[in-house]
Interface confidence: medium
């Protein structure tokens, strides 16, 4: 009796009801190997989840995160909201990179600036909250009164930047 | 390989009680800041509580404050959320979590591993 089981292809079950024929899953189920005695039920992409493929007799639903989120977790699991360029997800919520850090996408954490002066270089274009600085020639290469770098911004302290 | 392994969650009913528990294997739990993180249905992820490696400082969301409390047994290697007075809202999808970070209530999202959760659903 197993061998029957065994020769029912994917999206199929092994009916024990039935003197082990193959029946196809029913609506809304899937099994993706053969020789299985039940079908899963497929995954349901609501509310934050969109669905990426529809569910098929041989294989689940997949799902993203709506816009405004992000997947996390093994096959998209979980959604996490974005943030703006310039923030960081943080517990309770979205804040801004303290000065000094930088994030130029919607998820992740904020970074310190570049220290252009640890290479030697000079800072070309200060960083913001969005950007990093960038980094110009060493000060030694510019030769007097022909440096086109913007002079460093007035120093702040250290701490958050206004939301 | 890291795991974590959450079990606990079920049907309660308003005003009930429930015990959600975290088993956690692959790594020295004990160095580690935990979180419980949770996803209600059609929302995104709402962080619940923190509780830093020795189980001394310990952090909640607003909305689980006072009802909610998180605890840790590293002899046993497992995270802990005893969870009181619940409430419809509380319905979700519990997720414990491995921090790389300190745990404070206001770092970032500092999280390496996930576990599969586990489903809580408070209804009468």
């Known amino acids: 009796l197993q061998d029957l089981c065994s020769n029912c292809p994917a999206g199929t079950f092994c009916d024990n009801n039935r003197s082990q024929i193959c029946s196809p899953c029913p609506p809304n189920s899937f099994s993706s190997a053969g020789g299985q005695r039940t079908c899963d039920i497929c995954r349901q992409c609501k509310g934050v989840f969109k669905t990426r493929k529809e569910c098929s007799s041989t294989s689940n639903a997949e799902c993203d995160c709506i816009s405004g989120y992000h997947c996390l977790g093994a096959e998209c699991s979980m959604c996490e909201q974005d943030c703006k360029q310039g923030q960081e997800l943080t517990k309770k919520g979205c804040k801004d990179c303290c000065f000094g850090t930088f994030n130029d996408q919607k998820r992740g954490i904020c970074r310190p600036w570049t220290n252009c002066s640890l290479d030697g270089k000079s800072v070309l274009v200060n960083g913001t909250k969005e950007r990093d600085v960038v980094c110009g020639p060493s000060p030694a290469d510019l030769s007097p009164g022909a440096s086109s770098a913007t002079p460093p911004a007035p120093a702040r302290e250290p701490g958050h930047s206004p939301q | 390989e890291v795991q974590l392994l959450e079990s606990g969650g079920g049907l309660v009913q308003p005003g009930g009680s429930l015990r959600l528990s975290c088993a956690a294997s692959?790594?020295?739990?004990?160095?580690?800041?935990m979180s419980w993180v949770r996803q209600a249905p059609g929302k995104g992820l709402e962080w619940v509580s923190s509780?830093?490696?020795?189980?001394?400082?310990?952090y909640y969301a607003d909305s689980v404050k006072g009802r909610f409390t998180i605890s840790r047994d590293n002899s046993k290697n497992t995270l802990y959320l005893q969870m009181n007075s619940l409430r419809a809202e509380d319905t979700a999808v519990y997720y414990c979590?491995?921090?790389?970070?300190?745990?404070?209530?206001?770092?970032?999202?500092?999280?390496?591993?996930w576990g599969q959760g586990t489903t809580v659903t408070v209804s009468s």
């Open positions: 979590a491995k921090e790389g970070s300190h745990g404070t209530d206001d770092s970032h999202y500092d999280v390496d591993v």
């Open positions: 692959g790594f020295t739990f004990s160095n580690y800041a």
């Open positions: 509780i830093d490696a020795s189980g001394g400082d310990t």
